[in-house]
Interface confidence: low
């Protein structure tokens, strides 16, 4: 007899069918029968746990306790109720050496189990470069292709406009810096984005000295919270005016609220093409 | 500054519930971060008991799931443990904190604990 | 439960002396552990959050490494107020634990 539904898992729920649920009232559905927000549909005799999560595409990568990324939240919690286990968010933003594809449907899919290698040149390959052992001169390759991904103009946090989240995730791996979006549409301020050349491979460019114009206007109004204000902000800036008595909140992309505490489904990202992630 | 304090009996009796309070100062409850509650036996091992979240939801640690319950007063910037049957292994110094944002449960800021002795 | 073990319970060392106490978690936590260090009497007070991260006012001497199993705290230069019970914990997994501690004690 199953102590639980996940006794009964098949690949597309969990079906258990054929024992007497009146002996046992674990398979009639109610708020304790599907784990990790499963959704419980009951047909006839049998009871099965659907993992038909309705995630939206909102690139607001987050890391899991398991070692993979996640598009978004919502792909973490059905990654977790499709292998019925606990995947907290360890940090926002996809994990810094990233070891899974964050669809997380497989077991040792990115389990991002760390193994001891030789320290190397490559080790410092980071925001998606990977590792090219067998070339001259650049070690870190971004074989990121945004050939397909449509127009969706950005703002990123280093000043500069980018025709879609796939570039700036190109720019980010290019450059071996973090670079995120900031914004929907172009930057006030406009610059221009990088190129790769013909290999795969990427130099570093110089860019316009205005680059960081927007950044610095920003500043010149606000300073930053004080420190018992850590956490006044759940996703975003946390800004001082000498204007006002309360501080305020510069929302990161995908978000609102007076706290930044609310998802801003009104915004639509464009995901970027083969990269990193895979989704369900 | 965020501070956090405890406050609650200091004796409580086999079989009754421990009822202890958090006084949060400096920072709204439901403005962010998650409101725990740890334990510190004698022999100075930490248990992390559960959480309050800033909107209201809960995380308990299984193995007090049938006995702990934590709850706020949101008027009063407070939450609330209570631990019903206790035993002589419930005697642990109580404390307090904050958690950090979501993706990071470190605890950044403790109250200054409560000793609570389980005895007759 | 994921079990942290800090497997030495008590180290003796001096004043300026590096110090390195090490945290191994049961499976893996990613980056996802903190640091406290506690002082006789006192609440603790985190030290390293995501395993690597100084928090807020906590001095440069303290530094954290690790990810996956295997962590570390290094104190680069012992101050005579360093001499406390130091713990790890990890929150990769519900219920978030705790190590038994390692207490530095003068030699």
């Known amino acids: 007899f199953p102590t639980s539904l996940s006794d009964c898992q098949t690949p597309t729920g969990w079906n258990c069918s054929g024992y007497d649920d009146r002996e046992n009232d674990l398979f009639l559905c109610d708020t304790n029968t599907c784990k990790f927000d499963g959704e419980c549909l009951r047909i006839g005799d049998t009871v099965t746990c659907v993992c038909q999560f309705k995630c939206n595409n909102d690139y607001v990568p987050v890391c899991g306790s398991n070692g993979e990324s996640y598009q978004n939240e919502c792909y973490l919690r059905q990654a977790a109720c499709k292998q019925q286990s606990e995947i907290l968010v360890v940090s926002e933003g996809s994990c810094a050496t990233d070891a899974g594809s964050g669809s997380g449907d497989g077991v040792h899919e990115g389990s991002g189990e760390t193994s001891q290698k030789e320290t190397s040149t490559c080790d410092i390959c980071q925001f998606g470069a990977e590792c090219d052992e067998d070339a001259e001169d650049v070690w870190c390759v971004c074989n990121i292709d945004c050939s397909q991904t449509n127009f969706n103009p950005l703002c990123a946090s280093d000043g500069k406009s980018y025709d879609n989240a796939c570039q700036i995730k190109e720019a980010s791996c290019q450059k071996q810096e973090k670079i995120e979006v900031m914004s929907l549409g172009r930057c006030q301020d406009n610059t221009t984005t990088t190129t790769k050349s013909e290999d795969g491979h990427y130099a570093r460019t110089d860019y316009a000295e205005n680059a960081n114009k927007l950044e610095e206007s920003a500043r010149e109004h606000h300073i930053p919270c004080p420190e018992h204000y850590n956490g006044f902000c759940m996703h975003g800036k946390c800004e001082h005016s000498i204007n006002m008595q309360e501080p305020s909140c510069r929302c990161d992309a995908g978000y609102t609220g007076q706290h930044c505490e609310k998802k801003d489904y009104s915004v639509l990202y464009v995901v970027p093409g083969p990269v990193r992630f895979q989704y369900v | 500054d965020v501070q956090l304090q405890e406050s609650g009996p200091g004796l409580v009796k086999p079989s009754e519930t421990l009822s202890l309070t958090c006084a949060v100062t400096g920072y709204s409850i439901t403005s962010g971060y998650y409101w725990s509650w740890i334990r510190q036996f004698p022999g100075k091992k930490l248990e992390w008991m559960g959480f309050?979240?800033?909107?209201?939801?809960?995380k308990y640690n299984p193995s007090l799931k049938n006995r702990i319950s934590i709850t706020r007063d949101t008027s009063e910037n407070q939450f609330f443990l209570k631990l019903s049957s206790v035993t002589a292994a419930d005697t642990a110094t109580y404390y307090c904190?904050?958690?950090?944002?979501?993706?990071?449960?470190?605890?950044?800021?403790w109250g200054q604990g409560t000793l609570v002795t389980v005895s007759s | 439960d994921i079990q942290m073990t800090q497997s030495q319970s008590s180290m003796s060392t001096s004043v300026g002396d590096r110090v390195t106490i090490t945290c191994k978690a049961s499976q893996n936590v990613v980056t996802a552990v903190a640091w406290y260090r506690q002082k006789p009497g006192k609440s603790p007070k985190l030290l390293i959050y995501?395993?690597?991260n100084r928090h807020t006012g906590v001095p440069s001497r303290f530094s954290g490494s690790g990810s996956g199993t295997d962590f570390t705290l290094t104190i680069s230069s012992m101050q005579p107020e360093d001499f406390a019970d130091y713990f790890c914990?990890?929150?990769?997994?519900?219920?978030?634990?705790f190590g038994g501690g390692t207490k530095l004690e003068i030699k």
């Open positions: 904190a904050r958690g950090l944002r979501r993706g990071d449960y470190s605890m950044d800021y």
């Open positions: 309050i979240s800033y909107d209201g939801s809960n």
């Open positions: 995501s395993a690597s």
């Open positions: 914990q990890q929150y990769s997994s519900y219920p978030f634990t």
